[in-house]
Interface confidence: medium
């Protein structure tokens, strides 16, 4: 097929950078992070959307690996679990150095491309991972966090999640609390991408308005195509355009077709819609492979990206637009975030007020002065 051949030609030069893959969660769930378990061999790993041969076949050149700990760890062992998931990403990259190059910058991604390796970055999926601490946030940055999803599917004491918009969560922060605003400023200062997947619309707008740099939605689709509150509404897509930000489309069936069944063409409909409303510069891919139970027909695993690119070419996307969606848009946003960073500026120091800090198993050192 001409378009499939064209897709492969383009992807050899410009492989895909995907915004969100939950393989690290699968490694915890299946093997308790024991990578030396013979069943955990990533060259032969079965039962997952992701393994090394599939990554190669899919022309995956960059991946934000999701460091995720569930919401029920909030105010419990969220930080420990986060550190363990960061550790498993580091160990995975060291164990397969011919495949993965652990990187923390846009320049690192370009280096991985030159070496023919999968640029491997860490995205921390959920603000509860920082336990309402700017010190923990900075420590996670030192350990390689290069995006933070402000919430998962639960509120933090400082930001509201998407379930507020369904009525399943109560709004607490009206988008961002004053401490949440300090988190955003500190992420800007450090040069960490701010990820608005999973957050409420009020949090999306408050953050797009506050951030000194473009932001991303690492795995979200278009609300006008499928009215799931995990997707991005058109008024926010217009803000994405104005701020030169990025929406990386999630492939989960229920966010694509709003039913249990979906197909590749419907994913392309989301990409078309985002391109139409926010512009071609705003489009990317964040498949959420290994993080969702159902994926579209034609996008069964990470090897199938070329088929999606072929469909976009069939729909008259230009080569430049396709290359933007594959990698250039993410690289542009990441570079803008890096340029807006200022590590010489004084860090944010004001802690969250004690009465806003959730959880009952806490000491109060420092607060009682």
């Amino acid at each position: 097929d001409f378009f499939r051949d064209e897709a492969e030609r383009i992807m050899r030069d410009s492989p895909v950078i995907d915004g969100h893959n939950d393989l690290p969660w699968q490694l915890l769930d299946m093997f308790n992070n024991r990578l030396q378990d013979e069943r955990a061999n990533l060259t032969t790993l079965a039962g997952t959307h992701t393994n090394i041969p599939k990554l190669r076949a899919g022309f995956v050149g960059g991946q934000f690996w999701s460091v995720y700990t569930p919401c029920d760890t909030q105010n419990k062992d969220a930080v420990r679990r986060t550190l363990e998931q960061m550790d498993v990403v580091h160990r995975m990259c060291r164990m397969y150095p011919e495949t993965f190059l652990y990187v923390t910058s846009s320049a690192g991604i370009r280096q991985a491309f030159r070496e023919g390796k999968v640029a491997s970055l860490i995205g921390v999926e959920g603000g509860h991972s920082i336990d309402s601490s700017l010190g923990v946030l900075r420590a996670l940055y030192q350990l390689g966090m290069r995006y933070l999803t402000l919430t998962h599917s639960c509120n933090t004491p400082w930001a509201d999640n998407w379930l507020v918009d369904t009525g399943d969560s109560e709004p607490q922060s009206q988008g961002l609390s004053p401490f949440g605003q300090r988190v955003v400023k500190e992420l800007n200062r450090l040069g960490v991408l701010i990820d608005l997947a999973h957050v409420s619309v009020a949090t999306m707008k408050a953050t797009l308005q506050l951030s000194r740099a473009p932001v991303i939605f690492s795995h979200s689709s278009a609300y006008s195509v499928c009215a799931s509150r995990r997707n991005v509404p058109d008024d926010v897509l217009r803000l994405v355009k104005q701020t030169d930000s990025l929406v990386m489309v999630n492939f989960y069936n229920n966010y694509i077709s709003c039913t249990n069944k979906a197909n590749l063409s419907q994913v392309a409909d989301h990409l078309d819609h985002i391109k139409e409303v926010a512009g071609a510069r705003a489009v990317g891919f964040g498949g959420d492979f290994d993080g969702v139970p159902r994926v579209p027909e034609g996008l069964e695993d990470v090897s199938k990206y070329p088929d999606l690119i072929a469909e976009l070419l069939r729909r008259n996307w230009t080569e430049a637009e396709v290359k933007g969606a594959l990698a250039d848009n993410l690289l542009r946003v990441f570079e803008a975030v890096e340029q807006a960073s200022n590590l010489t500026q004084a860090p944010e120091e004001e802690p969250i007020p004690l009465d806003q800090l959730g959880g009952s198993c806490r000491t109060h050192y420092g607060y009682s002065s």
């Epitope: 605003q181 797009l208 701020t243």
Partner: nanobody
Amino acid sequence: EVQLVESGGGLVQPGGSLRLSCATSEFTLDYYAIGWFRQAPGKEREGVSCISSSGGTTNYADSVKGRFTISSDNAKNTVSLQMNSLRPEDTAVYYCAAARVSAYYLGNYGCLNAEYGYWGQGTQVTVSS
């Protein structure tokens, strides 16, 4: 918490002038925009004018351009709206509001389109002969 108190409203004849002031509680002016909005009876609230904390960005609704001027005095934490050549259709309750918003956003999108999170109680302006 940001507190906003409007003053300066009143009754004025068409063609006359008024100066509205918005006193803000002390807050870090970095990252703020202050806007004036108005709501006439039976109509939706509309943006009139806004200014960034630095004063570097000012926006006006088309209906007031050339007649209204917004200014800020950061030393006194006040934002003023000078309204000249007033018309009967300017009759409304005028509200002062504050938005947490970065210079980056303002440069891309202006301040009238921001999401304003803090609001005053409003002051009545009536233009009538």
